[in-house]
Interface confidence: medium
C-alpha cells in the first residue's frame, strides 16, 4: 500500500504519522482538526465545533 503521508495531507506544518489503518495528523500549536486545517483562536475558541470527547485542540485525530 502507498504511504498515506506521501501527499503531505496535514495542513499548517502538522506532522503526518502513517499507520496500518491510515494516517494521523499531529497539529502544530495553534491548529486543530483531523488535518490541522482549523486555527485555534487566541481566546481558546476554535473555528469548528467542540473537539470530540477526550481530544484537546491539537491532539492527533484520525
Amino acid at each position: 500500500r502507498a504511504d498515506p503521508c506521501a501527499a503531505r495531507p496535514c495542513a499548517h506544518g502538522g506532522r503526518c504519522y502513517a499507520h496500518f489503518s491510515g494516517l494521523v495528523c499531529a497539529c502544530a500549536p495553534g491548529y486543530m482538526g483531523a488535518r490541522c486545517e482549523f486555527p485555534v483562536h487566541p481566546d481558546g475558541a476554535s473555528a469548528l465545533p467542540a473537539a470530540p470527547p477526550g481530544l484537546r485542540p491539537g491532539d492527533p485525530q484520525r
Epitope: A2, R8, R15, A18, G22, R62
Partner: antibody, heavy 124, light 113 residues
Framework: EVQLVESGGGLVQPGGSLRLSCAAS????????VSWVRQAPGQGLEWMGY????????YYASWVNGRITINPDTSKNQFSLQLNSVTPEDTAVYYC?????????????????WGQGTLVTVSS | DIVMTQSPDSLAVSLGERATINCQAS??????LSWYQQKPGKAPKLLIY???TLASGVPDRFSGSGSGTDFTLKISRVEAEDVGVYYC???????????????FGQGTKVEIK
Amino acid sequence: EVQLVESGGGLVQPGGSLRLSCAASGFTFSNYGVSWVRQAPGQGLEWMGYIDPAFGRTYYASWVNGRITINPDTSKNQFSLQLNSVTPEDTAVYYCARVALVVAGVAYYGMDVWGQGTLVTVSS
Amino acid sequence: DIVMTQSPDSLAVSLGERATINCQASQNIYSYLSWYQQKPGKAPKLLIYRTSTLASGVPDRFSGSGSGTDFTLKISRVEAEDVGVYYCQSYYYSSGSSYGAFAFGQGTKVEIK
C-alpha cells in the same frame, strides 16, 4: 557542528532513579526531535522514548512507560531522561540521538546524529 | 507493539563479496525503515533512511530496498572497515494510543571470512 553530549552516568542504587542530560547544539528543533536509546552490555539497541520539542509532544516505549520521563530545557538546548525504580537490568550505555522528523517536507524518522553515550551501572 | 526481526544473526563474508541482511516488520511500516552500523565501543551510525536513501557520507556500496514488511540491506563489495553490527529500525504510529514509536531489530554481526 551538530553535536549531542550526554552526561550524568555512573553508579545508581537499585530502586533509585537515574537522571541523564543531553546537551544539543548546532541545530534548531523545528524539524528534529531527541530520542533516548540504551544498550545493555553485549546486547542490542533498545529505544526508550523521544521528544518533539516544537510540538511539545513526548512518546515513550510501552515497556518503559510509567517509569520514564523526558523533559526539555529548550532555553539551554538540553533534554533530560529520568528513569525510576531502576534494577540491575537497567545497567546500560544510554545514548541520546537526534531524530530527523521532517526533512524538506518529507517524513524521515531516522536518528542521524548520536551522542557518545554514557554508562549507567545499577548496583548496590 | 511492532517487532523487527533480522536475519541472519551473523554473517561471515570474504572481502569484495556481497553481504545481504534482511529485516522483517510484524506489521506494515510503509517505507519508514532505517539502517545503522555500529562498531565496538562506538555509537551507532545512520547508513540509510526511508528504506533506500543513503545518509550523508555513506559509500554507495551500501543500498537498501523493500517496503511494507520486508526490507533488505546490501553491501555490494565488503571492505574490512564494514565489520560491525548492523541494525534495522522502524518508525510506526499506533492511533489507538496516540503513540509514535521506534523499534530496532536484534542486530546482525558482519565479520570477514
